[in-house]
């Protein structure tokens, strides 16, 4: 190459189809054969083209056709008389990738090719999208500017044609302008929200735009608020209602999760309260849903959850009513005897001593969610309840000696069963049988019977002596013996008796005593009067 | 002088991968304003364009059968290698390599081309 | 996709004859058609780029004209080595698509 003439310009230039691209250029020739005076053309070629023949793509010489492909659409802008060959490319199309030369003419020496420093012209898709700028969360009623930007913008190139459109703008929406950049005022409703807004930016050839939708975030305050509840890890239900409030059942020692979630804009602060205490809260940018866990759910976690969410434009609540179901627990049985307000707890297998006669209340006492069914049997037999609409309680107004045995108090329920025992002993005073006596060879042999509860204890008394035992001189002997609820004691009395003297049998327990006398008389064929005392 | 040569499998299987190369010379694929295309022919049917790479290593390919392709280039061996994923019996064609005049997407030099059989 | 139409998919002519191949294109091209010539058992070989310019070293005989959507090939006189398979070509958008072709035979 002749080093007089030089170009600058750069090896590729790519845009993007359909929009327009200005390419620098600079070059330089010698001073030879021409003036001031003399015209300087400048032509662009494809290199496919044969200079001669073929039309350039675009020229400074008025009189020389140019591609048909490239009229109106390639222009020389450069003084190729200044050394400028820049040329604008406008609605790039794929046909226009190629390798292009510049050619200088001026006077009769210089005419240059400069074949081998052209640039090669690389047409792209279109995919570049124009930027919108618009705050974050939009107030509804409060005017807002969105800017759109395309960020592609040449010395010689013709603005694009912008373009708005979306439900939050007026049915008609926007007049297009033309400039780098569009400005469009609006005042979001509250419907706004969640909607596209989008801005167009349409290039010269038809069918060649871009565009960037963005949704709209208007302000509101939280609704749609849901509760669900997720038990055992398994996935979240929603509770079912029951009333106004939702109501769930969870039993004893499962694992519960409540989530609560809220529509709002901006983000609601999402707390959980049980009656009104924070069991937890989330900040607005913090996750979604908030949980609560339950791990092993307990009794006491039974009550009123509700989450509450809240942001500067208002709040909203939902409730939960969490019954946790278990079965009986700690069964016993409460006594309350002869009238006596005071009740002792009992629990299984306690023996429980009661004076016949006396009124006894028995009350069946056990905590169970729901209400355990209760009910007492005696012996097997299920006893009717004194109560029905308390059927743990069973009143005895006066305990016979029959109703001694074992009560069982049973708790039956879905979770599980349990039962709680006691042992009912009837207490009396002693019942005296005798004395009665029988004279025999060897002297007067009487014996005397009582039954009490506890098992009476019986003493033989003659006039103003206890008779203990056997007698030194041998004079009496005692023989004491008992079953059960029965005391026997046989007297033989030996030797002579003095006339007028009384005999008598005293039986007694804790409850009291009872007493029978014989008087004695001096026939020893007669009869043997009784006397009894208490 | 500009030359194109086509190689790969005469005889692929469905589902199989097709990997054909193209060794070229007479020319740098390093040099602006180069670029590659293959072109497909079923027999007795039309050429259809599959894909394209410049010399910056800047890929172009037919939508249509986008998921299947990629072409790449290996510049100092003067190669260029095209895959196609999943072939099916209608894939049956002469693969053609070509180059576009001064960068022009119409096409002065092709290769002999290769006859690739997709059959089970 | 743009779609490139051949008529006749069959052409009977005599040598010395002139032949007139057309082509549509589904939408508007510009002048990014190109022509090509195929024999049997050989590549395709460029003869027009651009609608109407002739490439280097291809016979005056073939001429290349329209814009739009309607091209045609002109053969003024044919020669036995022109008897092949002529396809047409758009560039003017994403994907290159040719035609189905036409059969030029000797009648």
């Known amino acids: 190459m002749d080093g007089r003439f030089w170009i600058r310009v750069q090896e590729s230039v790519m845009v993007p189809e359909g929009l327009c691209i200005s390419v620098p250029c600079s070059f330089s020739y010698p001073r030879q054969d021409w003036t001031g005076s003399t015209p300087a053309y400048g032509y662009w070629f494809k290199a496919v083209t044969e200079t001669t023949k073929g039309a350039p793509v675009a020229t400074n010489h008025q009189s020389r056709e140019v591609e048909m492909s490239t009229r109106g659409r390639f222009q020389l802008t450069g003084d190729p008389a200044k050394g400028n060959c820049s040329l604008v490319i406008r609605d790039a199309q794929m046909q226009d990738e190629s390798q292009y030369f510049f050619r200088v003419e001026r006077g009769s020496y210089v005419r240059y090719n400069f074949m081998n420093d052209g640039f090669f012209l690389k047409v792209t898709a279109l995919t570049q999208k124009p930027d919108v700028y618009i705050p974050e969360t939009l107030e509804p009623g409060q005017p807002v500017t969105v800017i759109c930007v395309f960020n592609w913008a040449f010395e010689e190139c013709p603005p694009p044609s912008f373009s708005w459109t979306g439900a939050a703008l007026s049915s008609q929406g926007t007049k297009p302008t033309t400039s780098h950049f569009s400005v469009l005022s609006f005042t979001p409703r509250p419907q706004d929200h969640n909607t596209d807004l989008t801005c167009h930016v349409d290039f010269s050839r038809k069918g060649v735009s871009a565009q960037r939708t963005v949704r709209l975030r208007v302000a509101y305050a939280p609704r749609d608020l849901v509760i669900s509840i997720s038990r055992d890890n398994t996935p979240a239900l929603e509770p079912q209602p029951q009333g106004n409030v939702p109501y769930l059942e969870a039993q004893k020692g499962q694992f519960l999760r409540l989530l609560c979630a809220a529509d709002s804009q901006p983000p609601a602060t999402l707390s959980w309260v049980l009656q009104n205490r924070v069991l937890s809260s989330s900040h607005p940018w913090g996750p979604r849903p908030l949980g609560l866990e339950l791990p092993g759910v307990k009794a006491g976690d039974s009550g009123r959850y509700t989450c509450r969410a809240e942001n500067r434009l208002g709040s909203q609540q939902r409730a939960l009513d969490l019954s946790v179901q278990y079965p009986p627990e700690n069964l016993r049985v409460m006594v309350s005897q002869a009238n006596r307000t005071v009740l002792e707890n009992l629990g299984n297998g306690t023996s429980l001593p009661v004076l016949e006669g006396q009124s006894l209340c028995l009350v069946c006492v056990t905590h169970s969610s729901p209400p355990a069914r209760l009910s007492w049997t005696q012996r097997g037999q299920v006893l009717s309840p004194s109560q029905p609409s308390d059927p743990g309680v069973l009143e005895l107004p006066r305990v016979q000696v029959e109703h001694e045995g074992e009560f069982t108090c049973h708790a039956r329920h879905p979770l599980g069963s349990q039962h709680v025992s006691l042992s009912l002993s009837v207490h009396y005073s002693p019942k005296l049988l005798g004395p009665s006596c029988s004279w025999e060879a060897e002297g007067l042999h009487c014996s005397c019977s009582s039954q009490a509860s506890p098992a009476p204890s019986l003493r033989w008394w003659l006039g103003e002596e206890l008779l203990e035992g056997n007698s030194s001189q041998d004079s009496f002997e005692v023989t004491p013996s008992s079953a059960g609820p029965w005391a026997n004691s046989s007297l033989s009395l030996h030797g002579g008796l003095s006339s007028g003297l009384r005999l008598r049998c005293e039986a007694w327990n804790v409850h009291g005593a009872q007493s029978g006398s014989i008087l004695q008389l001096p026939d020893k064929k007669g009869l043997i009067s009784t006397a009894f005392s208490n | 002088q500009v030359t194109l040569k086509e190689s790969g499998p005469a005889l692929v299987k469905p589902t199989q991968t097709l990997t054909l190369t193209c060794t070229f010379s007479?020319?740098?694929?390093?040099?602006?304003?180069?670029?590659l295309s293959w072109i497909r022919q079923p027999p007795g049917k039309a050429l259809e364009w599959l894909a394209h790479?410049?010399?910056?290593?800047?890929?172009r390919y037919n939508p249509s059968l986008k998921s299947r392709l990629t072409i790449s280039k290996d510049t100092s061996k003067n190669q260029v290698v095209l895959t196609m994923t999943n072939m099916d019996p209608v894939d049956t064609a002469t693969y053609y390599c070509?180059?576009?005049?001064?960068?022009?997407?119409?096409?002065?030099?092709w290769g002999a081309g290769t006859t690739v059989t997709v059959s089970s | 996709d743009i779609v490139m139409t051949q008529s006749p998919a069959t052409l009977s002519v005599s040598p010395g004859e002139r032949a007139t191949l057309s082509c549509k294109a589904s939408?508007?091209?510009?002048?990014?058609v190109a022509w090509y010539q195929q024999k049997p058992g050989q590549a395709p070989r460029l003869l027009i780029y651009?609608?109407?310019n002739r490439y280097t070293g291809v016979p005056a005989r073939f001429s290349g004209s329209g814009s739009g959507t309607e091209f045609t090939l002109t053969i003024s006189s044919l020669q036995s080595e022109d008897f092949a398979v002529y396809f047409c070509?758009?560039?003017?958008?994403?994907?290159?698509?040719f035609g189905g072709g036409t059969k030029v035979e000797i009648k």
């Open positions: 070509v180059r576009g005049l001064y960068g022009n997407w119409f096409f002065d030099v």
């Open positions: 007479g020319f740098s694929l390093s040099t602006s304003g180069m670029g």
């Open positions: 790479i410049y010399w910056d290593d800047d890929k």
């Open positions: 939408q508007n091209v510009g002048t990014a």
């Open positions: 651009s609608a109407s």
């Open positions: 070509q758009q560039y003017s958008s994403y994907p290159l698509t």
